[in-house]
C-alpha cells in the first residue's frame, strides 16, 4: 500500500511538471542544429514570442545566442 502511495505521488508530481507550465502555451524552442554552420537565406518566417518576425528558425536560434535571449517560436509564418 505504501509503495502504491509513493508511486501515485510520484506520478502526480510528474504530471504536474509535464503539465502546462506557461512556456508550452507560449511556444516551442527553435531547433538550432544548423545555426553553427550559418543560416540559410531561404525565407521561411517564424513569429517569435517577442512579437518579432524572423526570416527562418535558424535566424531565431542565431539571435538567441547573439543576444543571450530565450525567445520561443509562437507560430510558423510572420507575426
Amino acid at each position: 500500500m505504501k509503495v502504491t502511495g509513493i508511486f501515485l505521488l510520484s506520478a502526480l508530481a510528474l504530471l504536474s511538471l509535464s503539465g502546462n507550465t506557461g512556456a508550452d502555451s507560449l511556444g516551442r524552442e527553435a531547433k538550432c542544429y544548423n545555426e553553427l554552420n550559418g543560416c540559410t537565406k531561404i525565407y521561411d518566417p517564424v513569429c517569435g514570442t517577442d512579437g518579432n518576425t524572423y526570416p527562418n528558425e535558424c535566424v531565431l536560434c542565431f539571435e538567441n545566442r547573439k543576444r543571450q535571449t530565450s525567445i520561443l517560436i509562437q507560430k510558423s509564418g510572420p507575426c
Epitope: L36, G38, C39, T40, K41, Y43, G48, D50, N52, T53, Y54, P55, C58, V59, F62, E63, R65, K66, R67, Q68
Partner: antibody
C-alpha cells in the same frame, strides 16, 4: 546589393546626430544592420545593431545616448546619438550582418565623416 | 565581457614573406570570429568568417585558424597590396559588450 550612409558634417558639442543607412538589393526583414565608428587614426568601435526582427542592442558605452530605428518600407536604418562631444568625431559606417556567414559583416558602406567641434 | 586582444599592433614583412596575427578572446567564442582588412580611406573588407572560411574573392594566401579563445590570421607570400590594417571581430554575442573588434594590426610591406 549595397549599403550607404547619409552625409555627416560638422556638429557642435551637445548636438544630436542623426545618420541614415540606405540599403538596396535586400530586405531589412531578413538581415541585421550594425553601426560602427572609427575615430581618426584609431580602430573600429561597434555602436549597436538592429536585427531582422527589429530588436536593438547597443554597446555598453553607447546605450544611454543612442537609438537605432528602421523603416522596412523605405529600406533605411537610422542612428541617433545625443549629447555629442569632441570624442564622437569619427567616420561612421553601417554594415550588413550575414546570417549565412555566422554573423560576419559582409557588406560595408563607404562611411561618412562626423566632426564635433565648437 | 568577450574582450578581443589582438597582437602585434604593427608588423613589417618583406614581399614574399609570411605575416602572423593573433587574436585572443577573453571567453570562448567557438568559431564565431571574422577577420577584416582595411586600407586608408576605405571601409573594412571581410576576409575570413567562421574563423577559417575565406570570403568570396579573397586570395588563398590568407588563412584563418583557431577556435575557442585563440585565433590566428596568416598571410603567406605577402604582396604589396596586403599593406593594410587587419582587425579581428567576434560574432558570438553582443550582449553587454563594449566592443566586438580587436585593436587592429598594421601590416607594413617592405
Amino acid at each position: 546589393q549595397s549599403v550607404k550612409e547619409s552625409e555627416g558634417g560638422l556638429f557642435k558639442p551637445t548636438d544630436t546626430l542623426t545618420l541614415t543607412c540606405t540599403v538596396s538589393g535586400f530586405s531589412l526583414s531578413s538581415y541585421a544592420i550594425s553601426w560602427v565608428r572609427q575615430a581618426p587614426g584609431n580602430g573600429l568601435e561597434w555602436i549597436g545593431r538592429i536585427n531582422s526582427g527589429g530588436a536593438t542592442d547597443y554597446a555598453s558605452w553607447a546605450r544611454s545616448r543612442s537609438t537605432i530605428t528602421r523603416d522596412t518600407n523605405l529600406n533605411t536604418v537610422t542612428l541617433q546619438m545625443t549629447s555629442l562631444t569632441a570624442a564622437d568625431t569619427a567616420t561612421y559606417f553601417c554594415a550588413k550582418e550575414e546570417y549565412s556567414y555566422g554573423g560576419a559583416y559582409g557588406m560595408w558602406g563607404p562611411g561618412t565623416l562626423v566632426t564635433v567641434s565648437s | 565581457a568577450y574582450d578581443m586582444t589582438q597582437t602585434p599592433a604593427s608588423v613589417s614583412a618583406a614581399v614574399g614573406g609570411t605575416v602572423t596575427i593573433k587574436c585572443q578572446a577573453s571567453e570562448s567564442i567557438s568559431t564565431y570570429l571574422s577577420w577584416l582588412q582595411q586600407k586608408p580611406g576605405q571601409p573594412p573588407k571581410l576576409l575570413i568568417y567562421k574563423a577559417s572560411t575565406l570570403a568570396s574573392g579573397v586570395p588563398s594566401r590568407f588563412k584563418g585558424s583557431g577556435s575557442g579563445t585563440e585565433f590566428t590570421l596568416t598571410i603567406s607570400g605577402v604582396q604589396c597590396d596586403d599593406a593594410a590594417t587587419y582587425y579581428c571581430q567576434q560574432d558570438y554575442t553582443i550582449s553587454n559588450v563594449g566592443n566586438v573588434f580587436g585593436g587592429g594590426t598594421e601590416v607594413v610591406v617592405k
